[in-house]
Interface confidence: low
Amino acid sequence: VPDPCSNCSAGTFCGKNIQELCMPCPSNSFSSTSGQKACNVCRKCEGVFRTKKECSSTSNAVCECVPGFRCLGAGCAMCEEYCQQGQELTQEGCKDCSFGTFNDEEHGVCRPWTDCSLAGKPVLMNGTKARDVVCGPRPTDFSPGTPSTTMPVPGGEPGHTSHV
């Protein structure tokens, strides 16, 4: 005996045993293939999920994660907290980097700003929660425009001078 359900296209289900007619999927349900005996309930994008694509009679809703979270698993089955630059993931969730630390990645942990003074360099640009300090070049021993006399440094490399 032929299966009357095979005539039911996507978006319908072989729900009615009446003259082999097919029934449209009710609201909030879908069938993506022909011949289905029932429609599937549409996925609801709630909580940490938000709707990327609405459910239709022939396809399920597509969810994405709300800002601060990213998808995990097939079809965005789960959302995991996804900290932005300037934050790090702790047991309490995403927390801003404390003063003196930064994180310039969308993952990772807050790291201390570079201490320019350890390299004998000045701070060219202050650090932020999301950006490290930018150190300037190592200073010479004189300020520009100051009269000076140069003399070879004993044992020094050629071209190096010492300010008196």
Epitope: P2, G15, N17, E20, C22, M23, P24, S27
Partner: antibody, heavy 118, light 110 residues
């Protein structure tokens, strides 16, 4: 357009019984037909249906206990092995509808009484 | 399997009064609901189909409403001829419920 059931009688448990639904004024090639029963003092109970192409569907409790078949003008319901619980008035009803999915019974027969007793 | 729960099982009304019968489906039946009236010794008679459409020859005092899983039959200006048992019936599915009808509501007119 009319629907009339016949064949109801007193039978002993286990004796097969066939009820007949005779239709006039419309074609069984255009309408599906269903059997519904009602035990004395009880509600309506759907048994099964036969589609225009002769495909049958049954309520889960009725599978194996009933067989529906048809000719060009008649629909039969065979009670394969009646028990006392099958004592009821058996109705034949025409299924009608529109828009591919709105369905209802628009014509009913007067019913035929089946009594199963030893 | 879809199940229909009808409430109340019995209701009494005075002539001219109003009767409300409820039918709850176990899942959405998308307005695929019919209402029938049955008097003793008679077959059921179609009153309402597709949840709210009045069948031919049925008085306008009968009104069907509802959607999704909740449906209602309202009889306004009840008459003595309305004394009967009323049944709701869902659309038919291949994997049909064991009883496609509600349990019935007896309306007694005083």
């Amino acid at each position: 357009q009319s629907v009339e059931e016949s064949g109801g009688r007193l039978v002993t448990p286990g004796t097969p019984l066939t009820l007949t639904c005779t239709v006039s004024g419309f074609s069984l090639s255009s309408y599906a037909m269903s059997w519904v029963r009602q035990a004395p003092g009880k509600g309506l109970e759907w048994i099964g249906i036969i589609s225009t192409s002769g495909i049958t569907y049954y309520a889960s409790w009725a599978k194996g206990r009933f067989t529906i078949s048809k000719t060009s003008t008649m629909v039969d319901l065979k009670i394969t092995s009646p028990t006392t619980e099958d004592t009821a008035t058996y109705f034949c009803a025409r299924l009608n509808g529109f828009d591919d999915y709105v369905r209802y019974f628009d014509f009913w027969g007067l019913g035929t009484l089946v009594t199963v007793s030893s | 399997a879809i199940e229909l729960t009808q409430t109340p099982s019995s209701v009494s009304a005075a002539v001219g009064g109003t009767v409300t019968i409820n039918c709850q489906a176990s899942e959405s039946i998308a307005s695929n609901l019919a209402w029938y009236q049955q008097k003793p010794g008679q077959p059921p008679k179609l009153l309402i189909y597709a949840a709210s459409y009045l069948a031919s020859g049925v008085p306008s005092r009968f009104k069907g409403s509802g959607s999704g899983t909740e449906y209602t039959l309202t009889i306004s200006g009840v008459q003595s001829a309305d004394a009967a048992t009323y049944y709701c019936q869902s659309a038919f599915y291949v994997s049909s419920s064991d009883n496609a009808f509600g349990g019935g509501t007896e309306v007694v007119v005083k």
